[in-house]
């Protein structure tokens, strides 16, 4: 029987470092090895018939035990499939190796209205583009961490909001007078230093009533 395997199905490595993605195989008399890269809608061939393809040949080397990168960038994050087949035969096996290139978060950008109407919906956003793996977001009001569920903490029990740590979106619905304050957010991805945005003050104002 044939086997294709990697003892490291997930590899995490800081950006600009060398890395090896392992692929061990047995039971093939004339193995033909291919490596495919997948990330979202992108699919690229890294290695074809035991040879690194032109787009990778300057920075990737084929070894009998895997492929080795001289230096990885954030764009290399994705799933690599090692596919081994018998030359001119039916035997086939494959193994997937997930590569996560670690990049610390950058300073998040916030979109916070300077004023918003009480009783209406107010949307605050926080995002940063560099972090790999993607950052999770924590919101602060007047320097105090906002819990995911406002009812869980006395300080926020009068607020009505939904906080999404993955997207960084904070939605007040409805906004109340007590939501006035200085808001900032923090991005962290478990690698490098968590980064904090600028603080922006939001005023919850009464609805203008026409005479």
């Amino acid at each position: 029987s044939v086997t294709v395997h990697s003892s490291e199905p997930e590899v995490r490595i800081p950006e600009n470092n060398p890395v090896k993605l392992s692929c061990a195989y047995s039971g093939f008399s004339s193995p033909r090895v291919e490596w495919k890269f997948d990330q979202g809608d992108t699919t690229r061939l890294v290695c074809y018939n035991n040879k690194i393809t032109a787009s990778y040949e300057d920075r990737v080397t084929f070894l009998p035990t895997g492929i080795t990168f001289k230096s990885v960038t954030r764009e290399d994050t994705g799933t690599y499939t090692c596919m081994v087949s018998e030359e001119g035969g039916n035997s086939y096996g494959e193994v997937k190796v997930k590569l996560i290139v670690l990049v610390p978060p950058s300073k998040p950008t916030v979109n916070i209205p300077s004023s918003a109407t009480i009783g209406n919906r107010a949307v605050l956003t926080c995002s940063e583009q560099d972090g790999s793996p993607p950052s999770e977001y924590t919101w602060f009001k007047d320097g105090i961490v906002m819990p995911t569920n406002p009812k869980s903490t006395r300080a926020f029990s009068n607020s009505s909001y939904v906080l999404n740590p993955t997207t960084g979106e904070l939605v007040f619905d409805p906004l109340s007078a007590s939501d006035t304050g200085e808001y900032s957010c923090e991005a962290r991805n478990g690698y490098g230093t968590p980064m904090t945005s600028n603080a922006v003050r939001m005023e919850a104002v009464e609805r203008n009533v026409g005479v």
């Epitope: 060398p18 890395v19 090896k20 080397t61 035990t65 990168f69």
Partner: antibody
């Protein structure tokens, strides 16, 4: 014949550092990752980390990060493990091992004794 | 991390007899288990990989079996040179050794 020949026993004082070597022969040194394994007295084996001799890439078991540093000299087909800030907890036999998927060839071991 | 529980920790058997050692993984390891013989002053010697595949040059007195989380290793027709400590290794996801079994010949 594939062989991994390790350096001899070491007796060092607490706080010092040591460098253990592992010379490979009988195969293409850069084709296989080189692993280091620790065996404390009366205990089982645990992997410390590995180095890919082709490009110098390393991975460490979380437990040994900051304790061990792995390097290679391709010209002499030799792998090295540097252990720093030694304490009695580091007294053990250290092995180098070649990895395919499992560890197929091992060095004879280097005994490290940390004592004042 | 995957844990490997090896038993027994020691055993004694007669020349010509048979012994069996077991390793239980904390999760399914998909047959990716190897067995080693270890003697003092030497490095471990690979006997079996992928549950039951004998390494080149290893006599057929050594055998392995199992699946899922449960694996066993046997030596039949015991010989004096079989004394030593035996370890299992899971290599399905990273690498974890069992605690070892010390074999003595009566």
């Amino acid at each position: 014949e594939i062989q991994l020949q390790q350096s001899g026993p070491e007796l060092v004082k607490p706080g010092a550092s040591v460098k253990v070597s592992c010379k490979a022969s009988g195969y293409s040194f850069t084709d296989y990752s080189m692993y280091w394994v620790k065996q404390s007295h009366g205990k089982s084996l645990e992997w410390i980390g590995y180095i890919d001799p082709y490009n110098g890439g390393t991975r460490y078991n979380q437990k040994f990060k900051g304790k061990a540093t792995l390097t290679v000299d391709k010209s002499s087909s030799t792998a090295f493990m540097h252990l720093n800030s030694l304490t009695s907890e580091d007294s053990a036999v250290y092995y180098c091992a070649r990895q395919t998927d499992y560890f197929d060839y091992w060095g004879q071991g280097t005994t490290l004794t940390v004592s004042s | 991390d995957i844990q490997m529980t090896q038993s027994p920790s020691s055993l004694s058997a007669s020349l010509g007899g048979k012994v069996t050692i077991t390793c239980k993984a904390s999760q399914d390891i998909n047959n990716y288990i190897a067995w080693y013989q270890h003697k003092p002053g030497k490095g471990p010697r690979l006997l079996i990989h992928y549950t039951s595949t004998l390494q080149a040059g290893i006599p057929s007195r050594f055998s392995g079996s199992g699946s899922g989380r449960d694996y066993s290793f046997s030596i039949s027709n015991l010989e004096p040179e079989d004394i030593g400590t035996y370890y299992c290794l899971q290599y399905d996801n990273l690498w974890t050794f069992g605690g070892g079994t010390k074999l003595e010949i009566k």
